[in-house]
Structure formats: C-alpha cells, structure tokens
Interface confidence: medium
Amino acid sequence: FERTRSLQDPCSNCPAGTFCDNNRNQICSPCPPNSFSSAGGQRTCDICRQCKGVFRTRKECSSTSNAECDCTPGFHCLGAGCSMCEQDCKQGQELTKKGCKDCCFGTFNDQKRGICRPWTNCSLDGKSVLVNGTKERDVVCGPSPADLSPGASSVTPPAPAREPGHSPQ
C-alpha cells in the first residue's frame, strides 16, 4: 500500500483492512475479527457477511474483503451478490408458489431454475418443425417445405396431444 501523505486528512493514509481511529487513538487500527474495510480512509470497518442456513461460504471474509456466499445443493442464487437462495426444480419444471410444477404443454425449461418458456414457433420464420419440443427441450426448426428438393419428406407439424411435446402415435 503506497501512501500519499495528507496533512489535512490523516485518515486518508489508512489502507484497506484498517479503520481510522482518529480522535481516540490517532492511528489506523486493524479491523477487528469478523469485519473488513475494502477501501482506504474508512472511519469504521464493516461487519462480515455470514453465510448461514441455506447459504454456504464461497469465499471467506478477510480484513480487506467481505465474505461471498452461494447456495447449498438444491438451491441457486438470486439477486446481486447472491442475496437470496431459491429452490431448484427439475428440467421441465418451474417454481411456483405451490412448489415445482411441470411445464404446461407448448412450453419448456432446460434449466433447474427460471420459468417455462414457449416453444419456438417455426412457422413464423417460414420453417417447419424438425424435432418436436418436450417439457425439457425447445422444438428444432428445419428448412421450410419449399426449400426441400422434390421427393424429400418432411416431418408433419404436431397436432395437439395430451402428453406435452409429443406427436400423436
């Protein structure tokens, strides 16, 4: 830590990891255990974040940086700096107020977090469905029928079925 000496504010000489105990002690005091200061010239140290319960410690607190948390298995981070942990669901599901629910027909979720999203509508791009969608996977669009050479077969678009994402057998 290179100090540029300040006559007007000696506290500015205090590096990260210390606080300026100006009137009482006239010195930069080290941050007490379980506290930190990430910048110089601070008059107090901040209390370290504690990763408890569903949070677990990804990076320990040091005198110059706060602890960083992530989530225990079965949960994932939400918000800046992992301020919340949200329950994981399986692929093909989304988290609702009542817990994990399967994606409705015509939607999918390929992750353990987030919401179910609608399948791609191939026809909007003038294409046809090459691979049918499922709860876990989006449809795969193929070339439009006009692009196919004569005699080539294409997959017929699926008709609605009770089982999401599957063509009638």
């Epitope: 000489n13 009137n23 009482r24 006239q26 010195i27 930069c28």
Partner: antibody
Amino acid sequence: QIQLVQSGPELKKPGETVKISCKASGYTFTNYGMNWVKQAPGKGFKWMGWINTYTGEPTYADDFKGRFAFSLEISASTAYLQINNLKNEDTATYFCARRDYLGAMDYWGQGTSVTVSS
Amino acid sequence: ENVLTQSPAIMSASPGEKVTMTCRASSSVSSSYLHWYQQKSGASPKLWIYSTSNLASGVPARFSGSGSGTSYSLTISSVEAEDAATYYCQQYSAYLYTFGGGTKLEIK
C-alpha cells in the same frame, strides 16, 4: 516542511526535575499523536509512551509509569516531557517523534541530552 | 509485549556487496505496522522503510524490505559507504511500540 525542534541539553542532579519541550511545525499539530523515546548512551531505543494531541490523554509504557509526565501546549504546538525525582539511570537522549497513522514514527526531533550526575 | 530480535548485531560489508539483515518478532506482526529506521552516529533516527516494504522519501532504491508474520528483512542490493549506520526495526501492535536492538552496518 515538517519539523520537531527540541529544547537544549540538561545537566541535573539526582532528585531534581527536568522538563523537555518539543515544538512542532509544518503540519496540523492536533492531527497526529506524539511519541517519546529514550536512548541511553550506546544503547537502542525504548518507547516511553505517547500523548494524544487531540484529547490530551497520555499513555505510558510500563517502565515509564510514575515519575514521567507528558503534557501539551496546543496553542504553541508544543509537547512536553517532564521527569521527576531524576535518577542516574535517566541519563539518556530523549526524542519526540510524530506518531504516523500506521504505527511508524515518521518525523523525529533532534533529541535532548539529559545527564544526571551528583 | 512483542519482542523484536535483530540479527546480526554487527555486520561488515565491502562497497558493492549485497547485505541482508533480519528482524524476528516473538509474535506475529501485521506487515502494515513493521518499520525500519536508519540512525547515523550522533544523529536522530530517520524513518527508512515503512509498512515492511515502502521506502521513505529520499531513500535510495538499492534498499528494499520484505517479510510477513514474525520474520522481516532489510536488504541493500549494492552497499555504498554512506550506508554505514545502525538500522532498527520497530513494530506497533496492541497499542504498544517495540524496537529491535539494532544491526550496525560497517563498511570495509
């Protein structure tokens, strides 16, 4: 520029009192504490303690409790060291040194020689 | 009290030589609070290296400092005649200051 100017040499008899001054200039006196350091002839340094120039509160090292007193004259930007009931073993050079914010002594006075002899 | 022990007490070097002196603490010292002073005969000491490795204003670049925990050192990469002096380490912890006994550097 920053300077600490101490009073001149002293020759004293055992049992007498001496008062050494340390006049600071070139910085805001009340922003930085003042240390006092003893150096016996041919020896190293012993930290005697320090005085908070903002509150006037002195702190004494264990070996310098009792006969030693730190004081201030803020209007004159001056710190004082008084030694009462002088003993032969008080013969030394005494330094004032500015208390830097990271525990260093960044500016020193020129030293005041105190000789105690009967 | 954190006791600082300097070694060697006296050392001798020829101009151009590299020298290293050490300072050991009886308990751990924060590197921000470990400092070195130079004192020449009959003069007041000067802050020489502060916070383990930072050279004070006007100190030649041939000087360097390093260390952590309980072991610190001052090194002169190529000694010059003007470096003849006694070097003291000093620490601040638990609201107390302590000095090492000094290393006297003599130039041959």
